[in-house]
Interface confidence: low
């Protein structure tokens, strides 16, 4: 069993809440902060000691249709001489995001929320060495 | 999911765009994303650009808890375990979609919200600006 989450609010349904059929929820997909822009340092994917490339995945039955995934370029990390150092590891950093999936069943359509794991970039780590007895 | 009947003659009336408001199933697919168990989760400590994770909690949002990364150093950790200020630790940021309760406090009514999170840090060669 789950212990109650600290700070969890058991929502008292206000009168203004829209009626929703059982087992479903109403979702407005007009995005709040739609025009917010990422202000990351310039070209960090190329300047990183664990550089990465981006691939855009496209799915018309997903909202948003476009999801960008990063892939580490190397197994090792780039040293000060610009060479790959395989004593260190480039590893992916991942983050979950939500998408809306549209499903077709004959002449009907349904919508499902889905968690997607996005690789956002890479970082250089010291490897874990497992010693075998 | 919740099935919505399409217009008669639906093969020709396929709408390429998503409607502004949809009814979605309460069950979230991949809710417990089963990431590779062999992937170590201590990158934040082992990275040459280590970071701390700060908890951001908001009961009006799903997921209610999001972790924000903050780089520990301006520089990066070198082979001797010291901070090398010739390199920079920088945050990797990502826009993610979350659900915001709308109207507030309603249990089953949400709006998508885009938020910017720092997921981790990476070590980069600095851009050096030479002043004439």
């Amino acid at each position: 069993r789950k212990i109650p989450k600290v700070g969890h609010t058991f929502f008292q349904k206000p009168e203004s809440c829209p009626p929703v059929p059982g087992g479903s929820m109403k979702l407005d997909i007009g995005i709040i902060n739609e025009n917010q822009r990422v202000s990351m340092s310039r070209n960090i994917e190329s300047r990183s000691t664990s550089p990465w490339n981006y691939t855009v995945t496209w799915d018309p039955n997903r909202y948003p249709s476009e999801v960008v995934q990063a892939q580490c370029r190397n197994l090792g990390c780039i040293n000060a001489q610009g060479k790959e150092d395989i004593s260190m590891n480039s590893v992916p950093i991942q983050q979950e995001t939500l998408v809306v999936r549209r499903k077709h069943q004959g002449c009907s359509v349904s919508f499902q929320l889905e968690k997607v794991l996005v690789t956002v970039g890479c970082t250089c780590v010291t490897p874990v060495i497992h010693h075998v007895q | 999911g919740i099935t919505i009947p399409r217009n008669p003659g639906c093969p020709n009336s396929e709408d390429k765009n998503f409607p502004r408001t949809v009814m979605v199933n309460l069950n979230i697919h991949n809710r417990n994303t089963n990431t590779n168990p062999k992937r170590s989760s201590d990158y934040y400590n082992r990275s040459t650009s280590p970071w701390n994770l700060h908890r951001n909690e908001d009961p009006e949002r799903y997921p209610s808890v999001i972790w924000e990364a903050k780089c520990r150093h301006l520089g990066c950790i070198n082979a001797d375990g010291n901070v090398d200020y010739h390199m920079n630790s920088v945050p990797i940021q990502q826009e993610i979609l979350v659900l915001r309760r709308e109207p507030p406090h309603c249990p089953n009514s949400f709006r998508l919200e885009k938020i910017l999170v720092s997921v981790g840090c990476t070590c980069v060669t600095p851009i050096v600006h030479h002043v004439a």
Partner: nanobody, 122 residues
Amino acid sequence: EVQLVESGGGLVQAGGSLRLSCAASGRTYDAMGWLRQAPGKEREFVAAISGSGDDTYYADSVKGRFTISKDNAGITVYLQMNSLKPEDTAVYYCATRRGLYYVWDSNDYENWGQGTQVTVSS
């Protein structure tokens, strides 16, 4: 669903030791963790071990003092607590989760035991 039963809590003096056990039955898991909740405080991650037993994770506050381990069958997970401090006083829960990414996020644990009280007196 995984059923979890904790034992081994109790009252101990500062500097003393306790060994908590958590017996699991049911489906497999990717990680089992110990989490604790002190009165009036948030639930916090203490330690976790992967299903294979290869990987262990500790909160900074217990590193070097606490050791998480499991038996060969993977049915029981232990938390050996040494050099206990009064601030370790809390209800200790064992819980399972899927995935090893961000094991310290207590919200990601799915199945919880009933908890065992650990009190450290000064």
